[in-house]
Each structure stands twice: as C-alpha cells, then as structure tokens.
C-alpha cells in the first residue's frame, strides 16, 4: 500500500460509524474532476474503511483519491483530518 493509500485508510478508520456512512453519501455527489467516474452506490454503501480505500485508489489513483477524500472530509466539517491526510500524502 502506497503512502497516500495508507493516509486515506488512516483517515477513514478515524471516522465514527455515522461519519463513515455520511462520507459515503457525500462521495456519491461530490463534484469530480472531468474524466473520472463515480463509484457505484450499491457497492459503496456496504464497504468498510479498508474496502473503501481500495476502491478510492482503484477508481481515482492515489493522488487524486487522497485529494477527493480530503475534500469530502472538508465537506463534513473535518478540516483538520483533511489537512493531516494531505500533509501525510505530500511528505
């Protein structure tokens, strides 16, 4: 697992169950960069943090996956966690 993927997993594992559910719901509607598709809703909602990390990296690659994760965290009011994720990614 690369540095960015590990940082994504660390962030997702620090979410409460309620926050992880909210993260997934926001991920379904977050603005995406052109050329990227959305993770299918059915698959997304049943995933744990590890599966979700794998899916984010396979869909968006590590760099954009980390950026997208950070943006969803910011949308949730978790700016500090988003900043830590991006700092870990850019070390």
């Amino acid at each position: 697992m690369g540095r960015a993927a590990a940082a994504i997993l660390d962030a997702l594992e620090n979410l409460t169950a309620e926050e992880l559910k909210k993260f997934k719901l926001k991920l379904l509607s977050v603005p995406l960069r052109e050329g990227y598709g959305r993770i299918p809703r059915g698959a997304l909602l049943s995933m744990d943090a590890l599966d979700l990390t794998d899916k984010l990296v396979s869909f968006y690659l590590e760099t954009y996956g980390a950026e997208l994760t950070a943006n969803v965290l910011r949308d949730m009011g978790l700016q500090e966690m988003a900043g830590q994720l991006q700092a870990a990614t850019h070390q």
Epitope: K26, S29, V30, P31, N71, R74, D75, M76, G77, Q79, E80, G83
Partner: antibody, heavy 114, light 107 residues
C-alpha cells in the same frame, strides 16, 4: 426555511460570564461581529456527536456545548471585557458540499458594561 | 491562519451598474470560498458557496468565480436592494476566516 432561534440581547458586567443558546442542527458555528466590523469565527460544534473546533483566539474564553435532547447549541463566554461587546450569531452548515454557513440566527447582542 | 483580503473596502455606484468585488486568500483554498450579503441590522445571508455555486433563491445577477487564491463576486446589474456589506469566507481550513467586507453604497 430553517429558523435558528437565538435570544435578542444580554447585558453583562465586566469579568462575568454569559451563556448563549441556539436551537439548531448538524454543525453549528458561532460568529462574533463587533459594531461596524467584520465577522470572526469563534468555533463550531457537531450536534450529533459533540465534535468541536475552536479558533485559538477564543479558546480561553469560549466553551461550546450541546444539549441533544433539545437540539440546542450553547456557547459560554467567560471573563468578559468591553472588547467582547458584539453581536454573536449562530449559523448552520447544511449544504452538502463546501461547508458554507447557509442558515444564520438573528444574533444575540451582548453588551459588557458596569 | 488563512487571511482573506477583500477589496475595495467600499464602492459608490449607481443602480444598474456592473460590480466586481474581489477576495484574495493568503494560501490555496481550492474552491472552499463563500460569499455572504449583510444588510444593516440583519444577519448575513449566503449568496455563493464553493466559489461559484449560487445558493437557493439567490438572483442570477450574482455570480461567483475563481479558485485557489483569487475570487470574484460579480453583480451584473446592481439593484437598490443589493446595497449592503459583502463578506467572503473560507472553509478550507480551521479556523474558518472571513474578509473584512466590502460596503456597497449609492452614489
């Protein structure tokens, strides 16, 4: 249209404390505005899980709490001085993305005077 | 802390004019900028979020643009009811911060 309910005015003596309330939901922010000045963010609290974030400038004087049963957010402001005379707004972030403050209370005007 | 600088501080204008208000962030804030309108003795109201998304019920004469550090609020044809203070704010990092505001006044 969501209405955030805040009491209108509070008159307090220097050195005293005041507890401001706001009927709200989700993330609730507290924002200070002195007469003729800009907006200053004090901090916020998540009504569902109690998570808080503070502006370091206000951490020593502001304590954010929540009463889940009544969906009410509170900020206790302590050791008040004349510099703390201001309107204090509560605001919610309900828009799904970008975390703006989309609903605002009418504000509580706090006057610190002996 | 991220500093949001707004300019001009005030503008005198005539009804129907096109107005450009600017906001500069001290560091990259992506698109995490909102614009608020505040009339005298009233609480602020959200106009634009995510730099360019018009909030529900906001007239289409209000347009937001920009990203990273430079942001603009444009009012294509100012109406009397638009005379107010305008604040930009960032929600990219804590603490959340606002600009000092721009006051729109009648000439």
């Amino acid at each position: 249209q969501v209405q955030l309910q805040q009491p209108g005015t509070e008159l307090v003596k220097p050195g005293a404390s005041v507890k401001l309330s706001c009927r709200a939901s989700g993330w609730t922010h507290w924002v200070k505005q002195r007469p003729g000045q800009g907006l200053e963010w004090i901090g916020n609290i998540n009504l569902s899980n109690g998570r808080t974030n503070y502006n370091e400038k206000f951490r020593a004087m502001a304590t954010l709490t929540v009463d889940k049963s009544s969906s009410t957010a509170y900020t206790q402001l302590s050791s008040l001085t004349s510099e703390d005379s201001a309107v204090y707004y509560c605001a919610n972030s309900m828009v799904p993305h970008f975390f703006p403050m989309d609903y605002w209370g009418q504000g509580t005007s706090v006057t610190v005077s002996s | 802390n991220i500093v949001m600088t707004q300019y001009p501080k005030s503008m005198s204008l005539s009804i129907g004019e096109r107005v450009t208000l600017r906001c500069k962030a001290s560091e990259n804030v992506g698109s995490y900028v909102s614009w608020y309108q505040q009339k005298p003795e009233q609480s602020p109201k959200l106009l634009i979020y995510g730099a360019s998304n018009r909030y529900t019920g906001v007239p289409d004469r209000f347009t937001g643009s920009g990203s990273a550090t430079d942001f603009i609020l444009t009012i294509t044809s100012v109406q009397a009811e638009d005379l107010a203070d305008y604040h930009c704010g960032q929600s990219y990092n804590y603490p959340l911060t606002f600009g000092a505001g721009t006051k729109l006044e009648l000439k």
